[in-house]
């Protein structure tokens, strides 16, 4: 059942990176508008993106309240200009989204190498601790704050003159690696949540190489 001349939304898809979370759907509306509702499994429905002609709705503010909860959304279709109209069952047409658990499913954003410093044959590489939109005590939490030791970083590093990539790992945001004296190295990092089965890894950070401005070299 449903409203005359409206079609139900379909292909409801969660797009989420570092907890910035948007629900997308189809089709582009023709003479209809949409309203989105979201709830946890045990909670009440909350309406968002009222009577919109968009086919996406930013639900970040709702999911960051508890990123470990599982959320369900639904998209209601209404005839444009007659949003009070309901179908024969007395309720507008709607479609449910897949369930979404932000902590387990949000994509890990591309990390950034903040700095690297060489001291003799050791290099300290620091990964930027990216800020998320998750709040605690009115403060935005970093990715490390949210994931704790569940989040690790893999460092790929290689001599500028060579192709083989060595790896190092950390459950902080810092690496301390051994390098050969007099050699220039390049670095790239990847965020990983090993306990996950899907969306385990981020894309790689941009490559940073020694001899560029981000680094600092000290001969000891």
């Amino acid at each position: 059942s449903g409203t005359t001349n409206t079609v139900a939304a379909y292909n409801l898809t969660w797009k989420s990176t570092n907890f910035k979370t948007i629900l997308e759907w189809e089709p582009k509306p023709v003479n209809q508008v949409y309203t989105v509702q979201i709830s946890t499994k045990s909670g009440d429905w909350k309406s968002k993106c009222f009577y919109t002609t968009d086919t996406e709705c930013d639900l970040t503010d709702e999911i960051v309240k508890d990123v470990k909860q599982t959320y369900l959304a639904r998209v209601f279709s209404y005839p444009a200009g007659n949003v009070e109209s309901t179908g024969s069952a007395g309720e507008p047409l709607y479609e449910n989204s897949p369930e979404f658990t932000p902590y387990l499913e949000t994509n890990l954003g591309q990390p950034t190498i903040q700095s690297f410093e060489q001291v003799g044959t050791k290099v300290n590489v620091t990964v930027e601790d990216e800020r998320t939109l998750v709040r605690r005590n009115n403060t935005f939490l970093s990715l490390r704050d949210v994931f704790g030791k569940d989040l690790i970083y893999t460092l790929y590093y290689w001599k500028s003159s060579s192709s083989g990539k060595k790896t190092a790992k950390t459950n902080t945001n810092e690496f301390l690696i051994d390098v050969d004296k007099g050699e220039n190295y390049c670095f790239s990092v990847q965020a990983v949540i090993p306990s996950r089965t899907v969306n385990r890894k981020s894309t790689d950070s941009p490559v940073e190489c020694m001899g560029q401005e981000k680094g600092e070299f000290r001969e000891i």
């Epitope: 790992k169 459950n171 990847q190 090993p194 899907v198 969306n199």
Partner: antibody, heavy 120, light 106 residues
Framework: EVQLVESGGGLVQPGGSLRLSCAAS????????IHWVRQAPGKGLEWVGY????????YYADSVKGRFTISADTSKNTAYLQMNSLRAEDTAVYYC?????????????WGQGTLVTVSS | DIQMTQSPSSLSASVGDRVTITCRAS??????VAWYQQKPGAPKLLIYS??FLYSGVPSRFSGSRSGTDFTLTISSLQPEDFATYYC?????????FGQGTKVEIK
Amino acid sequence: EVQLVESGGGLVQPGGSLRLSCAASGFTISGYIIHWVRQAPGKGLEWVGYIDPSNGYTYYADSVKGRFTISADTSKNTAYLQMNSLRAEDTAVYYCARDDQSLSSPFDYWGQGTLVTVSS
Amino acid sequence: DIQMTQSPSSLSASVGDRVTITCRASQDVNTAVAWYQQKPGAPKLLIYSASFLYSGVPSRFSGSRSGTDFTLTISSLQPEDFATYYCQQHYTTPPTFGQGTKVEIK
């Protein structure tokens, strides 16, 4: 169920080439690192090399560097070991193994192995 | 490359015995050490991060670390435990294995 299945082994003459495949099921290889490990008859385990299928990064043991190439096809969920300029000492059972990319990176799943014999 | 020196290379023991195998890393590897069991066929993971029991592995297997020394202990050897055991470090690339310890029936 997580599974790794190697294929492509066989008898090859010294100087010859062979390509081994490692077909994965039950997980997506782009989320992990895939290693190749070999074991000569009656000997211990020797690491050969790895690939991160998400970016194509590789690293090889000195004993195979320049002769062996690891690649991956994420659409087929399969990793490959291309072996060129084969020598008698490359005779071994070749295993692929999954690295969960945690801090200690244990190889949590292994294939059954495929035997490569280099002999004239 | 980091060397993993495993000892003994073989040992004979009886069912019910307590068995200890050690591995010494040539430099610091933190806790990035795993232990594998191999019967004919592919190795199987027993212990990871030096002391964590892998899922489905009997609790008679345990691992410990003291500095660069790592130990695999089988508290009470069972008939199915007769096999070859390998340690492995993956603290740095390349990962390296110990030479193996063959546990045989006395």
